[in-house]
Amino acid sequence: AGVFELQIHSFGPGPGPGAPRSPCSARLPCRLFFRVCLKPGLSEEAAESPCALGAALSARGPVYTEQPGAPAPDLPLPDGLLQVPFRDAWPGTFSFIIETWREELGDQIGGPAWSLLARVAGRRRLAAGGPWARDIQRAGAWELRFSYRARCEPPAVGTACTRLCRPRSAPSRCGPGLRPCAPLEDECEAPLVCRAGCSPEHGFCEQPGECRCLEGWTGPLCTVPVSTSSCLSPRGPSSATTGCLVPGPGPCDGNPCANGGSCSETPRSFECTCPRGFYGLRCEVSGVTCADGPCFNGGLCVGGADPDSAYICHCPPGFQGSNCEKRVDRCSLQPCRNGGLCLDLGHALRCRCRAGFAGPRCEHDLDDCAGRACANGGTCVEGGGAHRCSCALGFGGRDCRERADPCAARPCAHGGRCYAHFSGLVCACAPGYMGARCEFPVHPDGASALPAAPPGLRPGDPQRYL
């Protein structure tokens, strides 16, 4: 025995165009409630067929009135879980139908009116006692997000809630062959009470009161060999009273795995390795397809149109996992350098840089000449929150890579004319001036304010800047 629990997270418009109209209005306020129907196995039955595993109805949600002109938001939900108790074993594979109902609260004669807003259905595999499983389903333009789990009710434990627990009889340990009941370590597994008379050698039970036969045995109490023969090969002392048992088939004989699955014996059972697109104990379940809406967080589902092919979720930035179910903490990779603050905006990463640093990842150190090569003989000068290059004559630009026009700064004084030269510049001085930049006047008496001109140059000749 146990309980299937369903938690509705949201019900609202799905992604994409064609958002549905709000189900409620100012004239007609309404509230939502949900119905869940469970069936064992993987039945493809109509929605009206019995909910053999059970059904449940939620409480009514808060009253909602649409704001005029506003798009339909996620609608307010009822509190709490939907719980479906099951009396027998949990089947492991099940089908579900979840219906979203609208209760209109206007002035209808005879009380509120109910109408079905959306219905989703699916087939799933689930072990009891496992964690919450998340799911997302679409019905028309509506989207339903929910989680579900199956849990056993004490004293039942196990993935099918078929093993029983009871308080320990001795403080230190459980009886022979009986295990502690995780997570109830202070309790022990209780032996199942099979149907009265069930053969202890050849029968067993997974639920109280039943008698299931081992390979090669039959009858209501598993006391009848499937086949006897003259004892050609005795099988040990235990066969003396029962005649000789023809060995029953192994668990993989006849291949119990459907849809091309391959069978392996396990210590006490068998295991099917299923081809892509199938799962279940015997590969009998067609795999999840894009129609089941398996991609979370806005992931795009591709492929899987037929049960034979697997689907792939293409995740939006910031999410990963086969179903885009995991949020990527991209800041954990510490992408911002030099102490920058990382901001994960969902659609993008941003780095907020400390003073003195810049760049998408704060990788540029504005103050640092280290590693900053100034070309063509320039030298790096720090200061003012930035670095700059002091370039050699004839070069300019941020890194001294550009050849400069040496005459651009009008370096020749007193009306001297500037000529660009391969090694720099040359000033042709106006009469009465001399010097590399025509900066010195020639004295009226013909003497220069400079020492005698170098040989070969007369005062007044163009002075080449060396």
């Epitope: 993935t159 022979p176 062959g177 295990r179 202890p200 050698e201 067993f204 014996e265 210590p267 006490r268």
Partner: antibody
Framework: QVTLKESGPGILQPSQTLSLTCSFS??????????VGWIRQPSGKGLEWLAL???????RYHPALKSRLTISKDTSSSQVFLKIASVDTADTATYYC??????????????????WGQGTSVTVSS | QTVLTQSPAIMSASLGERVTMTCTAS???????LHWYQQKPGSSPKLWIY???NLASGVPARFSGSGSGTSYSLTISSMEAEDAATYYC?????????FGSGTKLEIK
């Protein structure tokens, strides 16, 4: 205290049938979840699983040896038997029996060989 | 069948040294069905680590196990003389239930 002890012929000739007995104490093969397995180890080599039997008479055999192996039990005398037909020199090894018990896994029932016998040496020689 | 490959085949470690040996399966193995055994010359194997990471009774806490799928490992945090032995990994998942070829751990 769980103990297991193997016994066998020691030496036998090719094509004969090897009969091994595992006598155990400290547990019962009528207890749910209990099993006994056979494993062998040629001198200086690794371990090879051969067969196992459970409390409820479910059996498993190594697929490559299945046609030659027969495992059985006598619950009342706490013994498990293994027969290997048509032996040859490649069957020369130390043969161990081991108790198999349930261990708590993450999900479902799982098993381990938690106690082993001391082993019995078998030589196949003409 | 599921082949278990252990590496290295032989290794030596100094006392106090950290030791790690690995077991790689040819197909995925349920981690609850992967066990390690210790065997010393002239003795039978002993269950050492069960269900990947649980130490069997009496096994020192310096031993640990981890892994999932096809990759498993046994680690000794600080080698001691009594740890010199051969260690076998074993999958009790699918028949035939197989053992690795063993890692022989010696003292340097």
């Amino acid at each position: 205290q769980v103990t297991l002890k193997e016994s066998g012929p020691g030496i036998l000739q090719p094509s004969q049938t090897l009969s091994l007995t595992c006598s155990f104490s400290g547990f019962s093969l009528s207890t749910s979840g209990m099993g006994v397995g056979w494993i062998r180890q040629p001198s200086g080599k690794g371990l090879e699983w051969l067969a196992l039997i459970w409390w409820d008479d479910v059996k498993r055999y190594h697929p490559a040896l299945k046609s030659r192996l027969t495992i059985s039990k006598d619950t009342s005398s706490s013994q498990v038997f293994l027969k290997i037909a048509s032996v040859d020199t490649a069957d020369t090894a130390t043969y161990y029996c081991a108790r198999i018990a349930e261990v708590t896994g993450q999900v479902g029932l799982h098993y381990a060989m938690d106690y082993w016998g001391q082993g019995t040496s078998v030589t196949v020689s003409s | 069948q599921t082949v278990l490959t252990q590496s290295p085949a032989i290794m030596s470690a100094s006392l106090g040294e950290r030791v790690t040996m690995t077991c790689t399966a040819s197909s995925s193995v349920n981690s609850s069905s992967l066990h390690w055994y210790q065997q010393k010359p002239g003795s039978s194997p002993k269950l050492w680590i069960y269900t990947t990471s649980n130490l069997a009774s009496g096994v020192p806490a310096r031993f640990s196990g981890s892994g999932s799928g096809t990759s498993y490992s046994l680690t000794i945090s600080s080698m001691e003389a009594e740890d010199a032995a051969t260690y076998y990994c074993h999958q009790f998942h699918r028949s035939p239930f197989t053992f690795g070829s063993g890692t022989k751990l010696e003292i340097k």
